[in-house]
Structure formats: C-alpha cells, structure tokens
C-alpha cells in the first residue's frame, strides 16, 4: 500500500467521511448498496460551490445519483459505478476529496452502518484479482488502420499484487513474436504494438493472476488496409427535397476520397424533349464546380435560392478522382405556396423511381 492510501470496506448506505486533501481513499461496496461519499469543507470553513466528478467527467444528478455540495449518494450501485470520484471546487477545480470506489458482484453482508466488521469476510486485504475499471473494458474489438499503434489495457488489482501476461490466439505472446516487438507496462497493465501490420490480426488475451485466482479478458484486433478506390459518397445524400415556391433549398453531398476529389453539381435537363443523348448519356448542366477559391466543404453543399417551378427536377452530385467517378442523385419537388408540404421521402418514392 502506498502512503496516504487507506483501504476500507463499507456496508450499505455507510457514509464515508472525506480523506485529507491529497489522500485517496479506496472503498469497496457491494452490488445494490448505496454509495455515500462525504466531503466536509477543509478546516470546517465555507466551501463554496462544488462539483462531483467521476473518472474526469462531471456527475449529472438523477433519481439514482443524488448530488449535494458536501455529499454524493449513488443508489443501487453496480459495477459501472466503480471508478475514481472526486469533489472539486467549481471555480478552481481544486480537488477537495478523492475516492476510489469499487463495487463488487456480491452485495455486502449485514446491515450495520459503519461496515467495519466486514473487512475479514470480503477478501480485500488478501484476495483474488479483480478489474479496477471494468466499465472501460467494453471495447472488445479494435479496428485499426495499418501503420498506427494499438494499446490493450487490463487494469487490475488484488492482494498480493497480481502478475499480468499476454496471449495471442491462445498462445504465449512475447516481443520476439513480432517484427518491431511489443512494449509492456506492467504498472499500467498494458501492451503496446507500434505500427501494426495485417499479420498482427488476432485475439489478444490478458491473464491477470495471483495465488488466489486468475481473471482474463480477450480483445480482437483487426488491421485495416487501404486499397485505392474511387470516391465514396455517403449513403442517403443528397436527399430528396420538397419545397414551396420561393423558398430556399440545400442539397448535401458527403465525399470520402484518398486521392483529391473533384466535385461537381449537375442538373438533369431535357434537350428536344429527350433526357438522354443518342449514346444514353443524360443531358446535364453544370451548376457548381471547383474554382480557384472554392473549398471541398463548399462544394459539398448546393444552395438554391428563391426556387421556381423550373428548378424542380433531378440533381446529381458527381465526384471523381484519379481512380474513377461516383455519383448520387436526388429530386426536388416545387409546390405552389398554398399547397401543404409533402414529406420528402414520400416525394422520393414517387419521383426517384
């Protein structure tokens, strides 16, 4: 145990007085308990406005989370309530009290208020490993673009302090098993692999153990490779629109492209009563294209002001790069001012046929 750290086990609805500033109090509650933390003003003087923070994020009061200036109550505690709690002065963000809270699976036994006689039964002084931040171990799949870095973390505790080892696809994993090696931080319960490549794909398991038990967590790593492709246009954009005569309309087109894309907005027109030429290519007029001072962001929006009936029709966002072209189209329906608006998606089903 480090100096200034006290380990206690607390029963249901036990109020815990705050430690001296600078100390971190470690507290264990049972599932279903009411976590109650108390932070009296230092020296008994006025405290000023305070804020309660969990894992760096301000706590929002709710039916289950009761926040007061000197006291915090979390009712019906569960695993997700484990974490680092602090009471801070709102203006200066100075930490007045700091608590490390762990909520165990089993409800704490007995109804005594101070909980002091429970320490022998809970296995905190000597006990099997447990995850200290289970709520931050939910991301089981990491999909990482090649050449970036991956960090697996399995923050744990136990007494005696457990050891951590790593497996890849169920087998012992060591630095010599990969080009570029690995970096281990036992104090941070972490494994780092720099500049990942496709051969790094697989299941990575941390095994945390001491003489009282063993726990493990498996993460899956997928390494993504980029193959050159024509621009990708976001699905559903541009969207069909219905507008009243004289109103303003915006069409949006979101373009993803490795190579620098060239974006154009086109309006489909008729020539001699025909929408397509002899070769089947549609007749279009270019409404917007890249200019000297036009940014990609500006090109992703087509604005039509004070629309007329002539503006009704089909509009296309066309994006091209060195590999090829992609396009999405949408329809504009213009209604007389007195008619009620028709839902845009209904209009789409009528006109986009």
């Amino acid at each position: 145990e480090s100096l200034g750290t006290e380990q206690r086990v607390v029963g249901r609805a036990a109020e815990v007085p705050g430690p001296e500033p600078g100390q971190q109090e470690q507290l264990v509650f049972g599932s279903g308990d009411a976590v109650e933390l108390s932070c009296p003003p230092p020296g008994g003087g006025p405290m000023g406005p305070t804020v309660w923070v969990k894992d760096g994020t301000g706590l929002v009061p709710s039916e289950r989370v009761l926040v007061g200036p000197q006291r915090l109550q979390v009712l019906n505690a569960s695993h997700e309530d484990s974490g680092a709690y602090s009471c801070r002065q709102r203006l200066t963000q100075r930490v007045l009290c700091h608590f490390s809270v762990r909520v165990t699976d089993a409800p704490s036994s007995g109804d005594d208020e101070d909980g002091e006689d429970e320490a022998e039964d809970t296995g905190v002084d000597t006990g099997a490993p447990y995850w200290t931040r289970p709520e931050r171990m939910d991301k089981k799949l990491l999909a990482v673009p090649a050449a970036n870095t991956v960090r697996f973390r399995c923050p744990a505790a136990g007494n005696p302090t457990p050891s951590i080892s790593w497996l890849k696809n169920g087998r012992e994993f060591r630095g010599e098993h990969r080009i570029g090696g690995i970096k281990l931080r036992h104090q941070q319960w972490s494994l780092v692999m720099e500049s990942v490549v496709p051969s790094d794909r697989g299941n990575y398991t941390c095994v945390v153990e001491n003489k009282f038990g063993s726990i493990r967590q498996t993460y899956t790593l997928d390494v993504l490779e980029r193959s050159p492709h024509r621009p990708i246009l976001q699905a559903g954009l541009p969207a069909n629109q219905t507008a009243v005569l004289g109103s303003d309309v915006e069409f949006h087109c979101k373009v993803y492209s490795d190579a620098q894309p060239h974006i154009q907005w086109l309006k489909h027109v008729e020539v001699n009563g025909s929408k397509v030429g002899p070769d089947g290519t549609p007749y279009v007029t270019v409404l917007k294209t890249a200019g000297a001072n036009t940014t990609d962001k500006e090109l992703e929006v087509l604005s039509l002001h004070n629309v007329t009936f002539e503006d009704a029709g089909e509009y296309t966002c066309l994006a091209g790069n060195s590999i090829g072209f992609s396009h999405h189209s949408a329809w504009l329906v213009v209604l007389p001012a007195e008619e009620e608006l028709v839902e845009a998606d209904e209009a789409g089903s009528v006109y986009a046929g």
Partner: antibody, heavy 127, light 107 residues
C-alpha cells in the same frame, strides 16, 4: 526513410491567401495523417489542424476555423494548408508532421502522435 | 480548451545533471501526453508518447511518467545535445494543446 518537406511560405498582405504544401514520402499516407503546427517568432508551438487520411476527416484549432482548410492528394502523397483571410497574428513558421493514432481499448478517443516533422516554412503576414 | 502548464519555464543545469520538468493539465487527460524537444531553428522531435513510452531511437536517459493531470519528463544524465526547449502536448481533448515550453540552458 520518412521525409516531410513544406513549401509555399512567403510574404502576404493581411486579408490575403496562401497555400502551403507538405510533400511526404516513406510511409503509408493513406493510413495515417498529417498535422499542421505553427510557431510564431520567439513563441511556443500551436496546433493548427489535422487531416486524417483514413476517412478524410479534418479538425481545426478555433483560431483558424473557417479561414484555413487542410486537404490532401494521396496520389501525390501531399497535404495542403489553404490559408485565407490571413492576419498579422498568423505570422509563424508552419510545420507539417506525420501523425499516427494510438487506438486504445480503454478510451473512446484516439490519441494522436506527431512523430516526424518537416523543416518548416515561414509565413509572414504584413502590409 | 485543456490548458497545459509547464514548470519551470527555464532552468540551468550542467552536463551529467538529473533534470526534471513537470507538466500539469487543467483537466484529466489520462495518459494522452507527449513530450517534444526543439533546438533553435529546428523542427520539434518526439521523445515520449502516451506519458511514458519512449519513442524509437530516443536515448534511454529520457523517461516520462504520470497520468491524469500531472506528468514528468526526466533526463537522468544531461548531455550536451540535450540543451534545448521541451514541450508537453495533450491529445485527448480537442484541440490538441501544448505547454508553453521549458528551456534547458547550460549553467
């Protein structure tokens, strides 16, 4: 060998525009990113923005948002910083830096690390 | 924005000295902290990432520690090439922000 070479700096009048280029070589441009960082004469470092090649996303510092645009042509392995409506306070050496992500099981965010830097190009905004 | 405050702003030391620079974040940044070294007229160089991981090719006399809001860069035995300005930088919050720098000068 990883290399980044900036170009396009120079003297420009307030309100003017300038486009900086960052030619990169020696790493897979499409999987990582390019950040721009500037340093005013005698001052510290200020992050300007980042282009993330994997999804084409960009992020900017508030001080340049709406005026500066980062783009890239991955077929040329080159990133660009388009600077419009320039002000005297934009005077600085501009660096581009290869940027990779640290993807962590622990966090929803990605930590971005700038590991290779160009030599810098000086932009002076003055009338 | 997350403010990064380095201390001291400057220090004088001799070759062989152990030097410690601290960096404090205005809010929790977990371990998303990097340290850079910059010589006059040159581009910065990455030393440490994720608070404590030594970047490849960086001498082992450099080490980093800390998490949350308080971080430390230590140079165990100062060498002539280590006289420079050192910056910390967080990247957990948007925008990424740098400390104001610590200049390490020859005593």
């Amino acid at each position: 060998e990883v290399q980044l070479v900036e170009s396009g700096g120079g003297l420009v009048q307030p309100g003017g525009s300038l486009r900086l280029s960052c030619a990169a070589s020696g790493f897979p441009f499409t999987s990582t990113g390019i950040s721009w960082v500037r340093q005013a004469p005698g001052k510290g470092l200020e992050w300007v923005g980042r282009y993330w090649a994997w999804d084409g996303s960009t992020n900017y510092a508030d001080s340049v948002k709406g005026r500066f645009t980062i783009s890239a042509d991955t077929s040329k392995n080159t990133a660009y910083l388009q600077m419009n409506s320039l002000r005297a306070e934009d005077t600085a050496v501009y660096y581009c830096a290869r940027t990779y992500g640290i993807y962590d099981t622990y966090d929803m965010y990605t930590e971005y690390v700038m590991d290779y830097w160009g030599q810098g190009t000086l932009v002076t905004v003055s009338s | 924005d997350i403010q990064m405050t380095q201390s001291p702003s400057s220090l004088s030391a001799s070759v062989g000295d152990r030097v410690t620079i601290t960096c404090r974040a205005s809010q929790d940044v977990d371990t998303s902290l990097a340290w850079y070294k910059q010589k006059p007229g040159k581009a910065p160089k990455l030393l440490i990432y994720s608070a404590s991981f030594l970047y490849s090719g960086v001498p082992s006399r450099f080490s980093g520690s800390g998490s949350g809001t308080d971080f430390t860069l230590t140079i165990s035995s100062l060498q002539p090439e280590d006289f420079a300005t050192y910056y910390c930088q967080q990247s957990t919050g948007h925008p990424q922000t740098f400390g104001q720098g610590t200049k390490v000068e020859i005593k």
